[in-house]
Each structure stands twice: as C-alpha cells, then as structure tokens.
C-alpha cells in the first residue's frame, strides 16, 4: 500500500480541523490516478485528472468532512475505503507522582488537551546521576526502564524498589496518530512521600476517669515497618458539636487524652508522617468516637495503664533503637520562583 499506516485502527486516516488533509487510496500503486466519492453519495469529489494521483486533498477540513470515502481506479474497480477522523496532536500530559511508602511510588497523568483521537501513553523512568561522570560510562543501574502501567487503573504507572535518597526522572509521552508529546518530571521519594492514614483507630473510656479517653491505632498496612523508616503521628480530638480540634503529637501508637469534656462523645482522628519530616502528613484517618467514663473518680491508676510507661518505652525502644541515624533532609535546591520557566 502507498499509504503509511498511522497508529490506530486499520482503514482510518487522520487530520486536524482547519488544516489541509490528504487522504490516501490504499489499494493502488503510488501515483495511480483515482476517483474519490463520499460513501453512499454519487457525486464525484475529485476526478482522476486532478493531477494528485492516489491522494485526495481536503482544504481546511472540518467536522462535516469526517466519515468514509471511497476511491476507484480508472476501470471502476474499488481502490479502497478510507475513514477520516479529525482531532488534534497530543499536548504535553500533566503528570504528578506520589508515594505511600519509602520504596515505591506511582505516577498519574492526564492529557494536556483532549485530542479526540485514539491515544496511548509511553511511560519510563531513570535514576538521575550526579554530574561529573566524564570518564565513566553511564551505569545500567540508572536505567532507563519502563514504568509499568497499572492494568486496573488507567493513567497510572508504578515504580517498585526505588531508592529513598535518589532522584528519578519520569517520562510520560502521549502518542496519537498525529504525533507525540512528552512531559518530564523529576521526583525524590523523600519529597513526594505521603503515608496512608493510620488504621484501626479505637477510642475507649478510662474507667473512673471522666475526663480521660484512651486512643490507639496501628501503622497503615502499606507502610512496611522497618527500623530505619518510622512514622510519627498527630492526633486531633473534639467534643461533639464543638467546631475546633485540639491537636497533640503522641509518642508511639497510643495517647491518653486528659482534658476531655465529661459526658460528651468525642471525635478523634489521627494522621501520620515520616518521623524525620520527609514528604507531608497523611490524610486524616476516619473519625472514631468515644465518650469518657461516667463512673466515680478513682484514685488508683486503672489496670490497663499500670506499667503504661514501660509499655510505651518498649514500643519506642523496639522501633527506635536499631535505627541508624538517617542524614537530615536537605532543602531542595530548586527555583526560588517560577518566573520565565523553560516551557516543557
């Protein structure tokens, strides 16, 4: 066939509204004169004496030109049928990346503009290297590699086994039959880290203490607990119908609220963040509710908190003691403002 096959379904050719469009008769030899008709219409659009050979030229195509065309050879034989579809070349996709743990991240994208044409995305990434490798061949360990697209979630790819301290460049290229357009994004896991909210939040009264509530929770399931990468927590609580939250930063995985309003139900929620302040705070957990005990005041410490100090100590020791000090996070040496950015 003299017609180059654009990416997309067979038999379809593509053009841009407002531009000149050339349709190509697929079943003839290049340059052979043909006649062109709209499918189902007897009127000749372009005769074999046009001097355009096997091509039909539509000046300033618009939506009325979309549809199926038929080309015929000089002897009346069918040269082929062509469907014209109009749309736009890709614009640079908008890309963002996020991480819910310290060794994997995902990137999502959306089209910069709707092209109206069949579209696919090519996704890849590489580890950025420090300058100064004049004498060294680039290591295969820096990539590039494909960023595998999520079969269940369109417009998302996932990088597994990323290094927390490295910087990666993501390449998302939108491809359609009229061209391709690329967006690049540089990401550091430590900057895009946002844990999932803590799970299993429970709020319980403390028998004999009408102003106390005991809240406990667990790490999010997506955060593989490992001594080098701990989470810290922020807890908020408020009595029912009260507009303002009180905030505390607990140590470990529980907190005793000591200034609850007696007799009133309280909403409690908790959020998590890398313990060295990498990235941002998670979303808040779903609220849990609890009402302080209404029983008589007790002088004695209730059983559950007997040795509460040791329990907390044990949690902290278990999580903190094996952790070698991570280097403090350096501020990103990035633009101080966004004047005159280089267009991607």
């Amino acid at each position: 066939s003299p017609c180059p096959q654009a990416w997309g379904p067979p038999g379809v050719q593509y053009g841009q509204p407002g531009r000149s469009v050339k349709l190509c008769c697929p079943g003839v030899t290049a340059g052979d004169p043909v006649s062109w008709f709209r499918d189902g219409e007897p009127k000749l659009l372009q005769g074999p004496d046009s001097g355009l050979g096997h091509e039909l030229v539509l000046a300033q195509a618009d939506s009325t030109d979309e549809g199926t065309y038929i080309c015929q050879t000089l002897d009346g034989a069918l040269g082929g049928t062509v469907t014209l579809q109009l749309g736009f070349p890709p614009a640079r996709p908008e890309v963002s990346c996020q991480a819910v743990d310290y060794e994997n991240f995902s990137c999502t994208w959306s089209p910069g503009q709707v092209s109206g044409l069949p579209t696919r995305y090519l996704t890849s990434y590489r580890k950025k290297t420090l300058p100064g490798a004049e004498s060294q061949r680039e290591s295969p360990s820096t990539g590039p590699w494909p960023c595998p697209q999520d079969p269940l979630e369109a417009s998302r790819c996932v990088v597994h086994g990323a290094e927390f301290w490295s910087e990666y460049r993501i390449n998302v290229t939108e491809v359609n039959p009229l061209g391709a357009s690329t967006s690049l994004l540089d990401v550091r896991l430590q900057s895009i880290l946002r844990p999932d909210p803590p799970q299993g939040l429970r709020v319980e009264s403390v028998p004999g203490y009408p102003r106390r509530l005991h809240a406990s929770w667990t790490y999010p399931a997506s955060w593989r607990r490992q001594p080098h990468f701990l989470l810290k927590f922020r807890l908020q609580y408020r009595p029912a119908q009260h507009p303002a939250w009180s905030t505390v930063e607990p140590i470990g995985l529980e907190e005793v609220i000591t200034d609850a309003v007696a007799g009133l139900p309280h909403a409690v929620r908790v959020s998590a963040r890398d313990f060295l302040d990498a990235g941002t705070w998670s979303a808040w957990s779903p609220e849990a509710w609890g009402t302080p005990s209404t029983g008589p005041l007790q002088d004695e410490i209730p059983d559950w908190s007997q040795g509460h100090g040791q329990q907390l100590e044990a949690v902290v020791a278990q999580e903190d003691s094996p952790a070698p000090a991570r280097p403090s996070l350096q501020p990103d040496p990035r633009p101080l403002d966004h004047r005159d950015p280089l267009e991607q």
Epitope: K128, T142, S181, R334, P335, L336, P341, L342, E343, Q344
Partner: antibody
Framework: EVQLLESGGGLVQPGGSLRLSCAAS????????MGWVRQAPGKGLEWVSY????????GYADSVKGRFTISRDNSKNTLYLQMHSLRAEDTAVYYC???????????????????WGQGTMVTVSS | QSALTQPPSASGSPGQSVAISCTGT?????????VSWYQQHPGKAPKLLIY???KRPSGVPDRFSGSKAGNTASLTVSGLQAEDEADYYC???????????FGTGTKVTVLG
C-alpha cells in the same frame, strides 16, 4: 566513556551556511537537555542554543535567533546546529554540551553543563 | 541577555585563597538556585566545578566551594595550587532566553 564529539566546523564566507554535528556516546542521549556554547577567539563563553530531550522545545540567544536552528536525532544520538546567514562575529569555537536539567510539574530548568565536547572551529571570513 | 558580571582577574600565592564574585539580577542569579561554575584551561573545553550554587561534581577537589547571597554568587578556591591557574566562568539559569547566561569570566593567576 561518556563523550561528545563535534564536527562540521570550517571556513565559510559571510552569508554562507554550515551545519555542525555532535555525536554522543556512553549515556542515554534521549533523556538529556543539550546545548551549544561558543567562544570567540580570546573572548568568554556565550550560550548559543539549547534543546529539550524530546526535541519539542528549543531556545536561542538573541544574537543567533532566526539564523541558527538546533535539532537532534535521538535514534542516532546526535545533536545538530544548522547555521545560516553567517557573519564575521559568529567566528568562534563551538562546543556541544550536556545538561541533566531539572523538571518540576510546571516547567523545566537548565541546571549545569556537566559534559562538554572538545569544540569545533567555525571561521566566517571572505 | 546581559552577561553576568565577574572581575576580569584575581590572583593569589600557592596555599592562599581566592574568591571570585558573579553578579546578576533577581531574574537570574537571585531568582534561582541554578548557578554553576566552570574552569577552563587555555585551548581546552570548560569543566564543571560547581552546580546548584554549592554542589561539587564527583572528582572536583573540596578546595572549590560555591555560595550565593542575593543577586551575587561566589566561587572560593582555597589552598591555591599551580594547576588552578585558569579562566573561571559562572553561569545561571534565567536569562531572557529562558535558558542560561554566562559570566564575563575571571582569569586566576597563581603567583610565584
């Protein structure tokens, strides 16, 4: 070895044209910003032109805008500089250079040229 | 696209320190942390010494250091050695071409 090798320089008359090439090896060329920097005899460095990794965006110094065109062929790991309407003041050593750049969600920024070629001399004279 | 301003020359004896300034505007040096420094020996291609204001590429001795205050960046060469005699250029992102601009260059002479 990470390397850039320029070629295509030479003697050309004022108003003439020349095409410089820069062959890259030892790194994934298609992922890097590339640029041309020139240095007139006995003078300082002057930024000439740059190109985005995919080739989709380019930029030029005012002194060459409209006369020079930068392009790249990622399948051949080669950077080009097509120069038209050459003037005596375009006489210089032309260096090809690599930049990793930095890309935020809104824009890309040139950072630093970490790899340089050895340069090719362009002389514009009658 | 005005070049960044550097002193034409600087000198020092072996073992001493020399500092080179690079003055731009809030649209280039002052507006971004993309300031780099290059060393160029006669007849050779430039070599990257400092990038992103303060960072040293692998293989560059720690005698070379960079800093920035406002619209002025500085390169300091401490413990001067004979091989440090060269031309030094600063560069910054943010010229009016949205790409980069070089400094006027400073010739460093190692005395004695």
């Amino acid at each position: 070895e990470v390397q850039l090798l320029e070629s295509g320089g030479g003697l050309v008359q004022p108003g003439g044209s020349l095409r410089l090439s820069c062959a890259a090896s030892g790194f994934t060329f298609s992922w890097y910003f590339m640029g041309w920097v020139r240095q007139a005899p006995g003078k300082g460095l002057e930024w000439v032109s740059y190109i985005y990794p995919s080739g989709g965006s380019t930029g030029y110094a005012d002194s060459v805008k409209g006369r020079f065109t930068i392009s790249r062929d990622n399948s051949k790991n080669t950077l080009y500089l097509q120069m038209h309407s050459l003037r005596a003041e375009d006489t210089a050593v032309y260096y090809c250079a690599r930049d990793e750049g930095y890309c935020s969600s809104t824009s890309c920024y040139f950072d630093a040229f970490d790899i340089w070629g050895q340069g090719t001399m362009v002389t514009v004279s009658s | 696209q005005s070049a960044l301003t550097q002193p034409p020359s600087a000198s020092g004896s072996p073992g001493q320190s020399v500092a080179i300034s690079c003055t731009g505007t809030s649209s280039d040096v002052g507006g971004y942390n993309f300031v780099s420094w290059y060393q160029q020996h006669p007849g050779k291609a430039p070599k990257l010494l400092i990038y992103e204001v303060t960072k040293r590429p692998s293989g560059v001795p720690d005698r070379f250091s960079g800093s920035k205050a406002g619209n002025t960046a500085s390169l300091t060469v401490s413990g001067l050695q004979a091989e440090d005699e060269a031309d030094y250029y600063c560069s910054s992102y943010g010229g009016s071409n949205n790409a980069g601009v070089f400094g006027t260059g400073t010739k460093v002479t190692v005395l004695g």
